[in-house]
């Protein structure tokens, strides 16, 4: 073509993959009469006709532009759409009056790739390799044109660097055209790698400009002997009886060795091995003072069957012993004295406290209770609390019952008891003392006996309200080798002047009473009998 | 220091009665049980009653009641087994033992041997 | 009556031995945390010995090698490390109700 050594630079079009490419013709008024332009597209130097353009109107060639094409402007620009990575070429314009000039236009096409893929070795790197190993792989897929890739350890950029560091990165063509770039990073690598954070970026460019993309960081699994191993315990701090305790082995290799864990023998200074879970480690729960004791791991390189052991680690599980009470039953007269002493052993420094049963009120700081002139109601529970201050939680108690000798405690004297004839009572009557009384009953009915503790008895009595009864009453009777007390219940009769509007008298058991420890009213409910006659 | 000291067993015919006495010291007679306990020759040992100085009131295994009757002197300080109708099955060496509320046997008396034979 | 049963009735041990007796109860001999049952120590010609109290306390100037346990119907005595002076018949006994009764002894021979 005459001239063609002086053609100017065509002008550049760039376009995303999917997009559409407005080819404007840039012939001038003087160099072509655009109501008349054939439209080529160049490919390997070799021109084919694509688009025709006659007084105005267009018309696509048949070929594979024939459904993307169409005049825009007035005819002066072609739109070339859903645009292909194959689509980069050159496109020229032709006007063929008053002469022949054409106007070039290249087509630049782009596509950003998809998030680049990191895949780590899964099978790790041993420090000791003698040539870079695969550390990991970057794929960036469908990118156009070739994205570059840059490696990058801890934040910074890998530069190749002879037996040190390698990238080996290749690309496929996909039938779409797009590329798929797979980077590999060799390195050769080192103890501190074992926490490094290698990601790869891919650097593209857009009609927008130039952009890159980061993959996640992964680290690699670093391969690397163990030179120490050492106990740990959990939790850290005092430790004290039925704490949940966990002794475990650590190493600083990669991967650990085979651990073992041995508690010294106190008796033959011999290393126990003792039994450990599935992963490695010393549960001991609930933790006892015989846990106490000095341990020592042991970790076994199953590859080169090297065998390190820890430093020993001394384990104190604080503990405090049974608190023993003398004396243990103590039986006093009344007015005499008493004194307790509280005992216990710790690894630790002890603090007693004696305290009330009945009412926790603190009664002394120390192990030697003194209780002088005793009287009845000083008998019952007390109890010593051995604690160790510097550890909350490690404490054990022991209850002691003061036994004071005298004749049964009755809580009242008498009672009144609301019933209806032909009703059965169950009543119940209560009495203290030492040694422990017996209950009786002045009628005839269905009784039985209950120990409530040591020093005091119930005793339950069924009943069926009689006449005469009512006019008894009904005595209870405890007594014991140092004398007797009685209780009397009085029954009345229930009539609707006497009946409350809470008052419950419909149905149950009736229920009363007498103890030294219930000092409210009796109620009194009943359930309804046969007459006595039609009973068999 | 506390001590029980028994006496009075021996031979007796049977049919015969024996008064065995329970000398104590070193505490208060009057705040303590005591109890006396049998035990036959290569035999166990029996519960036979207790009293109660201080009330003398008494309380007998129903295996002895009627036979065997106790009873004490508070100006001695003595308890007596009072042993009637001897027959030859109640030969043993005769214990007695101090308690206090909770019926365990905390100072014994080294036994009084009784023989009842013809 | 309420019936103490012991076992074994006759055990042959050697000096240093752990050793236990055993006292089962006809029904429960416990009140509340408090358990009615007692042993005692009788060597041949002597008045038996207060061992334990209610079932686990300590008799002042007993040696510690013997302890007692157990509660309700169930009750051990036992000597962690026996003695030559530890050779005698052993006796449990409850005070629960009347009469009281012992059981009918363990004889702790020299093997």
């Known amino acids: 073509v005459p001239g063609e050594a002086e053609q100017p630079a065509p002008e550049l079009v760039e376009v995303e993959v999917g997009s559409t490419a407005l080819l404007k013709c840039g012939l001038s008024q003087s160099q072509g009469n655009l109501s008349h332009v054939d439209w080529f597209s160049v490919h390997k130097e070799k021109r084919t006709l694509i688009f025709r353009v006659r007084q105005g109107q267009g018309q696509s060639e048949p070929g594979e532009y024939e459904q993307r094409l169409s005049l825009q402007d007035r005819g002066a620009t072609l739109a070339l759409t859903q645009v292909t990575p194959q689509d980069e070429r050159i496109f020229l314009c032709q006007g063929k009056r008053p002469r022949s000039q054409e106007y070039r236009i290249q087509l630049r096409v782009y596509k950003a790739p998809e998030e680049p893929n990191i895949q780590v070795n899964p099978l790790g790197i041993p420090v000791n390799s003698k040539e870079p190993e695969e550390v990991a792989t970057c794929v960036g897929r469908n990118g156009y044109p070739i994205p570059q890739v840059i490696w990058y350890k801890n934040g910074r950029p890998l530069k190749e660097e002879k037996n040190r560091v390698h990238i080996q990165s290749s690309q496929t063509v996909e039938s779409s055209g797009l590329y798929t770039l797979q980077s590999i990073l060799k390195a050769q690598l080192v103890k501190e790698d074992k926490d490094a954070q290698f990601y790869c970026e891919l650097n593209y460019r857009l009609p927008s400009g130039n952009h890159m993309k980061e993959s996640r960081e992964v680290t690699v699994p670093v391969f690397y002997p163990t030179e120490k191993v050492w106990l740990e315990v959990e939790p850290v701090g005092m430790l004290k009886e039925g704490d949940r305790v966990e002794i475990r082995c650590l190493a600083d290799g990669n991967p650990p060795p085979h651990f073992s864990i041995s508690k010294q023998n106190p008796s033959t200074r011999e290393a126990e091995e003792e039994t450990t879970n599935d992963n490695g480690v010393l549960v001991l729960e609930p933790a006892r003072k015989e846990h106490s004791g000095r341990y020592e791991c042991q970790g076994l390189d199953l590859d080169t069957m090297i065998s390190l052991l820890s430093e020993p680690q001394e384990l104190l599980v604080n503990y405090v012993s049974d608190v023993r009470v003398s004396p243990a039953a103590p039986e006093r007269q009344e007015g005499s004295s008493l004194t307790l002493t509280c005992e216990a052993e710790s690894s630790q420094d002890l603090e007693f406290q004696w305290l009330r049963e009945e009412t926790g009120q603190v009664l002394e700081r120390g192990p030697v209770l003194q209780l002088h002139d005793l009287k009845r109601e000083a008998g019952g529970g007390y109890r010593c609390v051995a604690s160790v201050p510097s550890i909350p939680g490690l404490n054990r108690t022991q209850l002691v019952n003061v036994a004071i000798f005298g004749p049964p405690w009755m809580a009242f004297k008498e009672r009144k008891v609301w019933v209806k004839e032909n009703m059965v009572l169950n009543l119940s009557c209560e009495a203290s003392g030492h040694p422990r009384p017996t209950i009786s009953w002045n009628v005839n009915g269905t009784a039985s006996e209950q120990d409530q503790d040591p020093q005091r008895v119930l005793s339950t009595l069924n009943v069926l309200v009689t006449p005469e009864l009512l006019e008894t009453g009904v005595e209870c009777t405890a007594s014991n080798d140092l004398g007797k007390n009685t209780s009397i219940l009085f029954l009345e009769l229930v009539n609707l002047t006497t009946l409350t509007p809470d008052s419950n008298t419909t149905t149950g058991l009736s229920t009363s009473t007498a103890s030294p420890h219930t000092r409210a009213n009796s109620t009194s409910t009943e359930r309804k009998l046969p007459e006595p006659e039609s009973r068999g | 220091q506390v001590q029980l000291v028994e006496s009075g067993g021996g031979v007796v015919q049977p049919g015969r009665s024996l008064r065995l006495s329970c000398a104590t010291s070193?505490?208060?007679?009057?705040?303590?049980?005591i109890h006396w306990v049998k035990q036959a020759p290569g035999k166990g040992l029996e519960w036979i009653a207790r009293?109660?100085?201080?009330?003398?009131?008494?309380y007998y295994n129903e295996k002895f009641k009627g036979k065997f009757t106790l009873s004490v002197d508070k100006s001695k300080n003595t308890a007596y087994l009072q042993m009637n109708s001897l027959r030859a099955e109640d030969t043993a060496v005769y214990y007695c033992?101090?308690?206090?509320?909770?019926?365990?046997?905390?100072?014994w008396g080294a036994g009084t041997m009784v023989t009842v034979s013809s | 009556d309420l019936q103490m049963t012991q076992s074994p009735s006759s055990l042959s041990a050697s000096v240093g031995d752990r050793v236990t007796i055993t006292c089962r109860a006809s029904?429960?001999?416990?009140?509340?945390?408090?358990?009615?049952m007692h042993w005692y120590q009788q060597k041949p010609g002597k008045a038996p010995k207060l061992l334990i109290y209610?079932?686990?306390n300590l008799e002042s100037g007993v040696p510690s090698r013997f302890s007692g346990s157990g509660s309700g119907t169930d009750f051990t005595l036992t000597i962690s490390s026996l003695q030559p002076e530890d050779f005698a018949t052993y006796y449990c006994?409850?005070?629960?109700?009347?009469?009281?009764?012992f059981g009918q002894g363990t004889k702790l021979e020299i093997k």
């Open positions: 033992a101090r308690s206090g509320g909770y019926w365990y046997f905390d100072v």
């Open positions: 070193g505490y208060i007679f009057t705040n303590y049980w």
């Open positions: 009293i109660y100085p201080g009330t003398d009131i008494t």
């Open positions: 029904k429960s001999v416990s009140i509340s945390g408090y358990s009615y």
């Open positions: 209610l079932a686990s």
């Open positions: 006994q409850h005070s629960r109700e009347l009469p009281y009764t």
